[in-house]
Interface confidence: medium
């Protein structure tokens, strides 16, 4: 169950899905990927204030302990809850191959 | 597959399992948990430098883009890769109940 999607820090400041455009050169893939030439990378970015999109019990504990010991325990972190698959056309010794990567593009985000 | 467990920042500085002792009061559980009275909370704390314990392709992408756009893209974050279960004995309206929580204590850490 998703704990509160209302961001107390203001619109767009809390953990959510962002899209960052990246070239193969940006990603360091130019020597082994043929296509796509550019990737719309979806990733999870933003703050994780108390109970916002808490992934599980561990995230709730982390929030409580961060409040008590901010120098020791970091706040929960915005990370992918699930992924969208993506097909890369790769160079091989003999030609090309298609490979599906299941853990490349974030689909949904939560705090943990 | 675990990407490099050698921490370039110095011993103990990178993403790893830490134990933080917490009372029921610390966790805000005093009104609904009977036992344990104190929890040895295992959690993932530490930096995620390039390729250190990279969880997946997404983490590798994040590292690359963070290097290029540090103000836009955060570095990967140290989070649980797996959990240890824990039994909480809880107060109920009529008495007590036992509940296993599978997502309470971090068992292993990675960067994502």
């Amino acid at each position: 169950a998703r704990n509160g999607d209302h961001c107390p820090l203001g619109p767009g400041r809390c953990c959510r899905l962002h899209t960052v455009r990246a070239s193969l050169e940006d990603l360091g893939w130019a020597d082994w990927v043929l296509s796509p030439r550019e990737v719309q990378v979806t990733m999870c970015i933003g703050a994780c204030p108390s109970q916002f999109r808490a992934a599980n019990m561990h995230a709730q504990i982390k929030t409580s302990l961060h409040r008590l010991k901010p120098d020791t325990v970091p706040a929960p972190c915005c990370v992918p809850a699930s992924y969208n698959p993506m097909v890369l056309i790769q160079k091989t010794d003999t030609g090309v191959s298609l490979q599906t990567y299941d853990d490349l593009l974030a689909k949904d985000c939560h705090c943990i | 597959a675990r990407n490099g467990d050698h921490c370039p920042l110095g011993p103990g500085r990178c993403c790893r399992l830490h134990t933080v002792r917490a009372s029921l009061e610390d966790l805000g559980w005093a009104d609904w948990v009977l036992s344990p009275r104190e929890v040895q909370v295992t959690m993932c704390i530490g930096a995620c430098p390039s390729q250190f314990r990279a969880a997946n392709m997404h983490a590798q992408i994040k590292t690359s883009l963070h290097r290029l756009k540090p103000d836009t893209v955060p570095a990967p974050c140290c989070v649980p890769a797996s959990y240890n279960p824990m039994v909480l004995i809880q107060k109920t309206d009529t008495g007590v109940s036992l509940q296993t929580y599978d997502d309470l204590l971090a068992k292993d850490c990675h960067c994502i």
Partner: antibody
Framework: EVQLLESGGGLVQPGGSLRLSCAAS????????MSWVRQAPGKGLEWVSV????????YYADSVKGRFTISRDNSKNTLYLQMNSLRAEDTAVYYC?????????WGQGTLVTVSS | QSVLTQPPSASGTPGQRVTISCSGS????????VTWYQQLPGTAPKLLIY???QRPSGVPDRFSGSKSGTSASLAISGLRSEDEADYYC???????????FGGGTKLTVL
């Protein structure tokens, strides 16, 4: 008055099975977690198993894990302990007790003897 | 070998005060309440102290419990002959996900 009455004990050969029952009365059985505790002749108490009030959670001592099964029928106010693959070291008086951590009421116990 | 450690025996004369110790670790006594049980010869155990120091109704105030760190103790003041019994400490162990007892202490009233 709270009462717990165990039954089903007896003599059984090694490798055999027994099913113990504990009939509860004098309280709302479905509100309480219930436990089994055993005591070998001349020895101390050993916790065996606990089951939550609704039967959804069950925990066992390592010494009986995989061989014993705790269950309950709240409509009959009865707690059970199915014991399979019995060993000589399972010989003991078996008590049912109310609660998971503070055993505030105990039955009189039923003796299980595992011997050839 | 019990997870909780108790002395196997203790003794005292009528009117005396005796203390029974119970030692454990951070995963049991260190992080949980302790319960004490009294078992009179030939009978089922009886709850004596719960939540480390609380007495159920009907238990005389001669019996008291305390806990410090990973140890607990049961004190019996004004010892009586009817106190002659076996005494067990017990608590939940968070690492084992199960309940653990001490080996028991046989109290003799001299």
């Amino acid at each position: 008055e709270v009462q717990l009455l165990e039954s089903g004990g007896g003599l059984v050969q090694p490798g055999g099975s027994l099913r113990l029952s504990c009939a509860a009365s004098g309280f709302t059985f479905s509100d309480y977690a219930m436990s089994w505790v055993r005591q070998a002749p001349g020895k101390g108490l050993e916790w065996v198993s606990v089951i939550s009030h609704d039967g959804s959670s069950k925990y066992y001592a390592d010494s009986v894990k995989g061989r014993f099964t705790i269950s309950r029928d709240n409509s009959k106010n009865t707690l059970y302990l199915q014991m399979n693959s019995l060993r000589a070291e399972d010989t003991a008086v078996y008590y049912c007790a109310r609660g998971p951590i503070n055993f505030d009421y105990w039955g009189q116990g039923t003796l299980v003897t595992v011997s050839s | 070998q019990s997870v909780l450690t108790q002395p196997p025996s203790a003794s005292g004369t009528p009117g005396q005060r005796v203390t029974i110790s119970c030692s454990g670790s951070s995963s049991n006594i260190g992080s949980n309440y302790v319960t004490w049980y009294q078992q009179l010869p030939g009978t089922a155990p009886k709850l004596l102290i719960y939540d480390s120091s609380q007495r159920p109704s009907g238990v005389p105030d001669r019996f008291s419990g305390s806990k410090s760190g990973t140890s607990a103790s049961l004190a019996i003041s004004g010892l009586r002959s009817e106190d002659e019994a076996d005494y067990y400490c017990g608590t939940w162990d968070s690492s084992l996900s199960g309940y653990v007892f001490g080996g028991g202490t046989k109290l003799t009233v001299l």
